[in-house]
Interface confidence: low
């Protein structure tokens, strides 16, 4: 089928000890090959500091996945979610504390 770019959605949730968990979800994309990773200061975090979900079919002939990491509250600006799919790439910031989601559809 033709390429369908992912919808990327970044959320944050409070964690203990002054940390927050940030999750980057990519959905409704085809084909299933995708790079999704958290970056700090523009550099990908090591694998052992991130958690990935499986790339799963979402029932519409497209796919979804996610990646999460835990960061210090107040350091949000240093982190971005990097997505690469079918030759296109984009970066997505962590939303500020008073706004709990942020999503873009990339063409």
């Amino acid at each position: 089928g033709s390429t369908v770019p992912p919808m990327v959605n970044v959320t944050r949730s409070e964690a203990s000890e002054g940390n927050i968990t940030v999750t980057c979800r990519a959905s409704s994309f085809y084909p299933r090959n995708i790079i999704l990773t958290w970056r700090q200061d523009g550099v990908s975090l090591s694998h052992d500091t991130q958690q990935w979900g499986d790339v799963l079919p979402d029932g519409n002939g497209t796919y979804q996945t996610w990646v999460a990491t835990r960061i210090c509250r107040g350091e949000e600006q240093r982190f971005t979610c990097y997505m690469e799919h079918s030759g296109n790439h984009s970066t997505h910031p962590v939303p500020s504390g008073n706004s709990h989601h942020h999503h873009h559809h990339h063409h």
Epitope: Q40, V43, S44, T49
Partner: antibody
Framework: EVQLVESGGGLVKPGGSLKLSCAAS????????MYWVRQTPEKRLEWVAT????????YYSDSVRGRFTISRDNAENTLYLQMSSLKSEDTAMYYC??????????????WGQGTSVTVSS | DIQMNQSPSSLSASLGDTITITCHAS??????LSWYQQKPGNIPKLLIY???HLHTGVPSRFSGRGSGTGFTLTISSLQPEDIATYYC?????????FGSGTKVEIK
């Protein structure tokens, strides 16, 4: 070969201003975070300021926030540090340094030769 | 702010000795620690990044270990050209902070 060449240092009176420059070559300047670090006469290293690759984010140490401004010109491959309201405790050697990128995460992998700033009446 | 407690402040060792320098972070910095060598009259140079990764061109007698709050730099078979001051730097949280330095001399 990565090269970072600082300029603009000198002797300035308290309350005065200076603008430091750092000319970068040998790498894709716009792809990397850039930093200013200073070394005091006692040889202590102090981080001063950081600017992100896309000019989106800047960070400052508490000791210079509101007085110093870091900026970059990606077209000219140049990093700047505008310093104002200078104090005697700003006397130091100022180094421009390059963020490590994917080959050296969370590190400053190349440093310039430094430019000396002396604040004295 | 994260404090970096580096020790010892100076040490004297014989050629061929193995020496260890320690940095202790006041908070968990994962592996966001790098080590620098500054020879007399020269500029700082990166030795180790990510706590344990040797920077390009650095001799293999240098090694780094640690994660969380405790980190070490080891120089095995000390050479005359290793006379220098060594600094650690944490990159986990702003403000970035350096250790106070360890001056290494030959007996």
């Amino acid at each position: 070969e990565v090269q970072l060449v600082e300029s603009g240092g000198g002797l300035v009176k308290p309350g005065g201003s200076l603008k430091l420059s750092c000319a970068a070559s040998g790498f894709t300047f716009s792809d990397y975070y850039m930093y200013w670090v200073r070394q005091t006469p006692e040889k202590r290293l102090e981080w001063v300021a950081t600017i992100s690759d896309g000019i989106t984010y800047t960070y400052y140490s508490d000791s210079v926030r509101g007085r110093f401004t870091i900026s970059r010109d990606n077209a000219e491959n140049t990093l700047y540090l505008q310093m104002s309201s200078l104090k005697s405790e700003d006397t130091a050697m100022y180094y421009c340094s390059k963020g490590g990128g994917s080959t050296a995460r969370g590190a400053l992998d190349f440093w310039g030769q430094g430019t000396s700033v002396t604040v004295s009446s | 702010d994260i404090q970096m407690n580096q020790s010892p402040s100076s040490l004297s060792a014989s050629l061929g000795d193995t020496i260890t320098i320690t940095c202790h972070a006041s908070q968990n910095i994962h592996v966001w620690l790098s080590w620098y060598q500054q020879k007399p009259g020269n500029i700082p140079k990166l030795l180790i990044y990510g706590a344990s990764h040797l920077h390009t061109g650095v001799p293999s007698r240098f090694s780094g270990r640690g994660s969380g709050t405790g980190f070490t730099l080891t120089i095995s078979s000390l050479q005359p050209e290793d006379i220098a001051t060594y600094y650690c730097l944490q990159g986990q949280s702003y403000p970035l902070t350096f250790g106070s330095g360890t001056k290494v001399e030959i007996k």
